[in-house]
C-alpha cells in the first residue's frame, strides 16, 4: 500500500505575494489524523515553510505566526502561502503523513514551482 501525493507543477504568485495550490493524497488507510508539511527546496537547500496537523473533517490549524493558511476537504488540502517575494521563488513540496491510527504512512509530492515577481513601483504621475 503506497500513498501518492499530487500537487500542481507550477503556480504563479499574485502581485500581493500570495500563492495557492492544492495538495491531494490517495490514502491507503482510514486516517483520522493527518500532518501536512510544506518544504521549500532551492539551491539544494531544504527549509520547512510550515506544518499543520489536523483531524479529518476539521480545519487545518497552522501556528499563529505561520505564513501558511489552509482548508481541508476529504483527502485534499488547499494551501495558501502569503508574504512571498521574488527571492522566495522555488520548489514547494507537499509532505503528507498519516499519523493516526497506525500504521503510519508517508507521501511526498513532486513539488510545485512557485514563481514570485516583485511588483514594479508605481511611476510618478502628473495627474
Amino acid at each position: 500500500k503506497a500513498m501518492h501525493v499530487a500537487q500542481p507543477a507550477v503556480v504563479l504568485a499574485s502581485s500581493r505575494g500570495i500563492a495557492s495550490f492544492v495538495c491531494e493524497y490517495a490514502s491507503p488507510g482510514k486516517a483520522t489524523e493527518v500532518r501536512v508539511t510544506v518544504l521549500r527546496q532551492a539551491d539544494s537547500q531544504v527549509t520547512e515553510v510550515c506544518a499543520a496537523t489536523y483531524m479529518m473533517g476539521n480545519e487545518l490549524t497552522f501556528l499563529d505566526d505561520s505564513i501558511c493558511t489552509g482548508t481541508s476537504s476529504g483527502n485534499q488540502v488547499n494551501l495558501t502561502i502569503q508574504g512571498l517575494r521574488a527571492m522566495d521563488t522555488g520548489l514547494y513540496i507537499c509532505k503528507v503523513e498519516l499519523m493516526y491510527p497506525p500504521p503510519y504512512y508517508l507521501g511526498i509530492g513532486n513539488g510545485t514551482q512557485i514563481y514570485v515577481i516583485d511588483p514594479e513601483p508605481c511611476p510618478d504621475s502628473d495627474f
Epitope: 503506497a2 500513498m3 489524523e33 518544504l39 493516526y100 497506525p102 500504521p103 508517508l106
Partner: antibody, heavy 119, light 108 residues
Framework: QVQLVESGGGVVQPGRSLRLSCAAS????????MHWVRQAPGKGLEWVAV????????HYADSVEGRFTLSRDNSKNTLYLQMNSLRAEDTAVYYC????????????WGQGTLVTVSS | EIVLTQSPGTLSLSPGERATLSCRAS???????LAWYQQKPGQAPRLLIY???SRATGIPDRFSGSGSGTDFTLTISRLEPEDFAVYYC?????????FGPGTKVDIK
C-alpha cells in the same frame, strides 16, 4: 551541531523495568520524529518506537507494544523510553535516532546504551 | 510489515574494487522511501543514502543508490579501506519501519 546522548542502560532482571534517556542538542525535538532503534549482540538493527512532533502520537514495534512507553520533556529537550516487563530478548544496544526531513530515515544517531536483561 | 532481504550476506573484495549490494522488499516500497546505512564495529550506524538515491550530507560520491519498487542497489564504485563494514537497507514509507539483515563487506 546536532548531538544525541543516551543514558540509563545497565543490567536488569527479567520482569523488571528500566528507563533510558536521550538528551538532544543542536535542534528542537518537537520539529522531528524521534526514534529508538536497538541492536542485539551480533545481530542486525530493529526499529523499536517513534514519538512524533508534538508528542501526542507514538508508534511501537509489535515486539514492545504494551511494555515500552515513549515520552518527552521539551524543557530539557530530552526523550525517554520507559521499558517495563523486560525479557531476555530485549537485551541490546539501544540507539536514539532523529528522523529526517524527508521521512523516517535516521540522519543522526546517539552512541547507544547497552541494556542487558539477565537473571 | 515490509520484509527486506539483503544479498549477498558477505561480500569479500579488495580495495579499489567495485561493490554491488542488493536489497529486495517483500512488497513495493512506496516512492522509493529506502535508506542505506554503514556500520562499523562498536559504532552507531551512519546514514549514506535516503530516497533510494540521494546521498546524505558529507557522504563521498563513490557511494550511490538506485532502484525502485522492490529492488534496490547500493554501489561503492571503488572500495577504500574505511569502507569495509556492514551495510543495512531500511524502508520508511510505512510503519513498522524495517531494516534488512545486513551485508558485510570484508577484505579479500
Amino acid at each position: 551541531q546536532v548531538q544525541l546522548v543516551e543514558s540509563g542502560g545497565g543490567v536488569v532482571q527479567p520482569g523488571r523495568s528500566l528507563r533510558l534517556s536521550c538528551a538532544a542538542s543542536g535542534f528542537t525535538l518537537s520539529n522531528y520524529g524521534m526514534h529508538w532503534v536497538r541492536q542485539a549482540p551480533g545481530k542486525g538493527l530493529e526499529w523499536v518506537a517513534v514519538i512524533w512532533y508534538d508528542g501526542r502520537n507514538k508508534h511501537y514495534a509489535d515486539s514492545v507494544e504494551g511494555r515500552f512507553t515513549l515520552s518527552r520533556d521539551n524543557s530539557k529537550n530530552t526523550l525517554y523510553l520507559q521499558m517495563n516487563s523486560l525479557r531476555a530478548e530485549d537485551t541490546a544496544v539501544y540507539y536514539c535516532a532523529r528522523g529526517g526531513v524527508w521521512g523516517s530515515y535516521f540522519d543522526y544517531w546517539g552512541q547507544g546504551t547497552l541494556v542487558t536483561v539477565s537473571s | 510489515e515490509i520484509v527486506l532481504t539483503q544479498s549477498p550476506g558477505t561480500l569479500s573484495l579488495s580495495p579499489g574494487e567495485r561493490a554491488t549490494l542488493s536489497c529486495r522488499a517483500s512488497q513495493s516500497v512506496s516512492s522509493s522511501y529506502l535508506a542505506w546505512y554503514q556500520q562499523k564495529p562498536g559504532q552507531a550506524p551512519r546514514l549514506l543514502i535516503y530516497g533510494a538515491s540521494s546521498r546524505a550530507t558529507g557522504i563521498p560520491d563513490r557511494f550511490s543508490g538506485s532502484g525502485s519498487g522492490t529492488d534496490f542497489t547500493l554501489t561503492i564504485s571503488r572500495l577504500e579501506p574505511e569502507d569495509f563494514a556492514v551495510y543495512y537497507c531500511q524502508q520508511y514509507g510505512t510503519s513498522p519501519f524495517t531494516f534488512g539483515p545486513g551485508t558485510k563487506v570484508d577484505i579479500k
